[in-house]
């Protein structure tokens, strides 16, 4: 059965450059290993932001990526990307691969447009 990946269409990053959004897939397959990849689309280019494999025991992901974190629960991944700046504004896609047990499935969300606004620099204080 085809898997559908859903994610919010728009998210606004915080003033500290942190954006969080869920990535969910359905139907909920009985899967021991799920690989989640966050991709950024700019024009026709697609680049990997971060990727991780979640398991029943390993529900905290992206340990190799300083700017990504995520938690996995059943068929929902809560993703957080930090260190974002205005130039990072763009469409972020969530790709889900059901790795084990077989069969392998792949699904892709439609993307979350993350808007990042750089904070205004603090004015110099005169004493």
């Amino acid at each position: 059965e085809a898997i559908q990946v859903t994610q919010p269409s728009v998210v606004l990053a915080s003033s500290h450059g942190v954006a969080s959004f869920p990535c969910e897939y359905s139907p909920s397959h009985n899967t021991d290993e799920v690989r989640v990849t966050v991709l950024r689309q700019t024009n026709d280019q697609m680049t990997e932001v971060c990727a991780t494999t979640f398991t029943e025991k390993n529900t905290v992901g992206f340990l190799d990526y300083p700017f990504c974190s995520g938690t996995f629960n059943e068929s929902r991944v809560n993703l957080t990307i930090q260190g974002l700046r205005a130039v990072d504004t763009g469409l972020y896609l969530c790709k889900v691969e059901l790795m084990y047990p077989p069969p392998y499935f792949v699904g892709m969300g439609n993307g979350t447009q993350i808007y990042v606004i750089d904070p205004e620099p603090c004015p110099d204080s005169d004493f």
Epitope: A2, T37, L39, M46, E48, P102, P103, Y104, V106
Partner: antibody, heavy 123, light 107 residues
Framework: QVQLVESGGGVVQPGRSLRLSCAAS????????MHWVRQAPGKGLEWVAV????????YYADSVKGRFTISRDDSKNTLYLQMSSLRAEDTAVYYC????????????????WGQGTLVTVSS | DIQMTQSPSSLSASVGDRVTITCRAS??????LNWYQQKPGKAPKLLIY???SLQSGVPSRFSGSGSGTDFTLTISSLQPEDFATYYC?????????FGPGTKVDIK
């Protein structure tokens, strides 16, 4: 240039075993997933098995599950297909093919193929 | 398993003709579809991946389109070297099934 050369085919009796090899050259073997695809005489293509670039995942067609095992030896740049409990319907040309393991939107596809090795299962 | 069907199973055409081959999946496979060309006694050759991406070195007269369950391979102007059998393949889920093939021969 990319080269894939299959070997190990031949005539074998039903119920027996055979191991096919695929020697790869011209690319970084350990960076690619690898597939086996077969083609019975006068028939179409049938996907058999795939092994991920790092050997972490292996998937099989239902028709060979439990009888065939795909493996790889990156130190020898070689892909293998161990076939056991062979049946007449396994008679085919067996192709190995490489697949870029990291496909963002493209899925997995076989971009280079060997010329194939013929396996005939007959008593 | 996902079943792939192709139509027509065979067709006769002349050099210069526009040829269209269709492939249908038994369930949605997004854009995870590839097209291969095979000539007698030869290994298959990748033409199109991801439904519409042209493989490097493949002539631009080949194009692919479609998404979901219905896909098309088009040869805009058939050349003598294009007479062959064409297969579609889904890579959405294992087993990565092929279609039964479409044989293109000379009218």
């Amino acid at each position: 240039q990319v080269q894939l050369v299959e070997s190990g085919g031949g005539v074998v009796q039903p119920g027996r075993s055979l191991r096919l090899s695929c020697a790869a050259s011209g690319f970084t073997f350990s960076s690619y997933g690898m597939h086996w695809v077969r083609q019975a005489p006068g028939k179409g293509l049938e996907w058999v098995a795939v092994i991920w670039y790092d050997g972490s995942y292996k998937y099989y067609a239902d028709s060979v599950k439990g009888r065939f095992t795909i493996s790889r030896d990156d130190s020898k740049n070689t892909l293998y297909l161990q076939m056991s409990s062979l049946r007449a319907e396994d008679t085919a040309v067996y192709y190995c093919a490489r697949a870029p393991h990291y496909a963002i939107l493209t899925g997995y596809y076989e971009d280079y193929w060997g010329q194939g090795t013929l396996v005939t299962v007959s008593s | 398993d996902i079943q792939m069907t192709q139509s027509p199973s065979s067709l006769s055409a002349s050099v210069g003709d526009r040829v269209t081959i269709t492939c249908r999946a038994s369930q949605s496979i997004s854009s995870y579809l590839n097209w291969y060309q095979q000539k007698p006694g030869k290994a298959p050759k990748l033409l199109i991946y991801a439904a519409s991406s042209l493989q490097s070195g493949v002539p631009s007269r080949f194009s692919g389109s479609g998404s979901g369950t219905d896909f098309t391979l088009t040869i805009s102007s058939l050349q003598p070297e294009d007479f062959a059998t064409y297969y579609c393949q889904q890579s959405y889920s294992t087993p990565f099934t092929f279609g039964p093939g479409t044989k293109v021969d000379i009218k």
